[in-house]
């Protein structure tokens, strides 16, 4: 599965969610929905 | 008003393969990912997986790793799944949705109307 | 992968009497204090409708009679007063990790 990586927000590693503080806008992905500041 | 529209019904035979588009309008197609969820007949739930119409990448269920391909048009803001090596087990409703990230205020969630895969010999 | 596991597979109830619902997921959908757990109703012929996200929240529209209660491994929704519209299959799910998963379903009927 891919890695899904931002500046922000969170990241997949071995499908698992790891969240940060910060939050994601939605100008740098589409929103996956269901999540706290998910995009990719 | 946000509304995913898809494909119609698909009759296939055992090992064939099929491709379900949902069509997006009423938004920007590029905000939302678009997920997949099939049932089969009678049963419950099941995710398999989801695609990016901003960046093309997709996230599937291991359980379809190898038979399942969701795309994206965004000259036309459809999104395609595409299953392949069908068998009987494949037949079910297969829809299309979009949801909001919890942090947005409000939650909502859009469902195409499905669409009906049987998959016989 | 985490499996949700629903209860009852049925449930038969009086009109204006509660009807509670249970799911169990194999491993806690908490994350940094939030339950990733919702919760949607499905009518015969029609998609799932989101009714209750992060364990809580209502989604938009539901009415306030749906609730939802829970945290890490053990939830439950409540429906406070059962009206006929209500007659659906209803389903939990986790959002804390890819793959997504549903619990089974249960199936609520008016007694």
């Known amino acids: 599965d891919a890695e899904f990586r931002h500046d922000s927000g969170y990241e997949v590693h071995h499908q698992k969610l790891v969240f940060f503080a910060e939050d994601v806008g939605s100008n740098k992905g589409a929103i996956i929905g269901l999540m706290v500041g998910g995009v990719v | 008003q946000v509304q995913l529209v898809q494909s119609g019904a698909e009759v296939k035979k055992p090992g064939a393969s099929v491709k379900v588009s949902c069509k997006a309008s009423?938004?920007?197609?590029?905000?939302?990912?678009i997920h997949w969820v099939r049932q089969a007949p009678g049963q419950g739930l099941e995710w398999m997986g989801f695609?990016?119409?901003?960046?093309?990448?997709?996230n599937y269920n291991q359980k379809f790793k190898g038979r399942v391909t969701m795309t994206r048009d965004t000259s036309t803001s459809t999104v395609y799944m595409e299953l392949s090596s069908l068998r009987s087990e494949d037949t079910a409703v297969y829809y299309c949705?979009?949801?909001?990230?919890?942090?947005?205020?409000?939650?909502?969630?859009?469902w195409g109307q499905g669409t009906l895969v049987t998959v016989s010999s | 992968d985490i499996v949700m596991t629903q209860s009852p597979d049925s449930l038969a109830v009086s009109l204006g009497e509660r009807a509670t619902i249970n799911c169990r997921a194999s491993?806690?959908?908490?994350?940094?204090?939030?339950?990733?757990l919702n919760w949607y109703q499905q009518k015969p012929g029609q998609p799932p409708k989101l009714l209750i996200y992060?364990?809580?929240k209502q989604g938009t529209g539901v009415p306030d009679r749906f609730s939802g209660s829970g945290s890490g491994t053990d939830f439950t929704l409540t429906i406070s007063s059962l009206q006929a519209e209500d007659v659906a299959v209803y389903y939990c799910?986790?959002?804390?990790?890819?793959?997504?998963?549903f619990g089974g379903g249960t199936k609520v009927e008016i007694k």
């Open positions: 949705a979009r949801f909001d990230n919890f942090d947005r205020g409000y939650v909502r969630d859009y």
């Open positions: 009423g938004y920007t197609f590029t905000t939302y990912a």
């Open positions: 695609t990016s119409p901003y960046s093309g990448v997709s």
């Open positions: 491993e806690s959908v908490d994350n940094d204090r939030i339950s990733f």
């Open positions: 992060a364990a809580t």
């Open positions: 799910q986790q959002s804390k990790e890819f793959p997504w998963s």
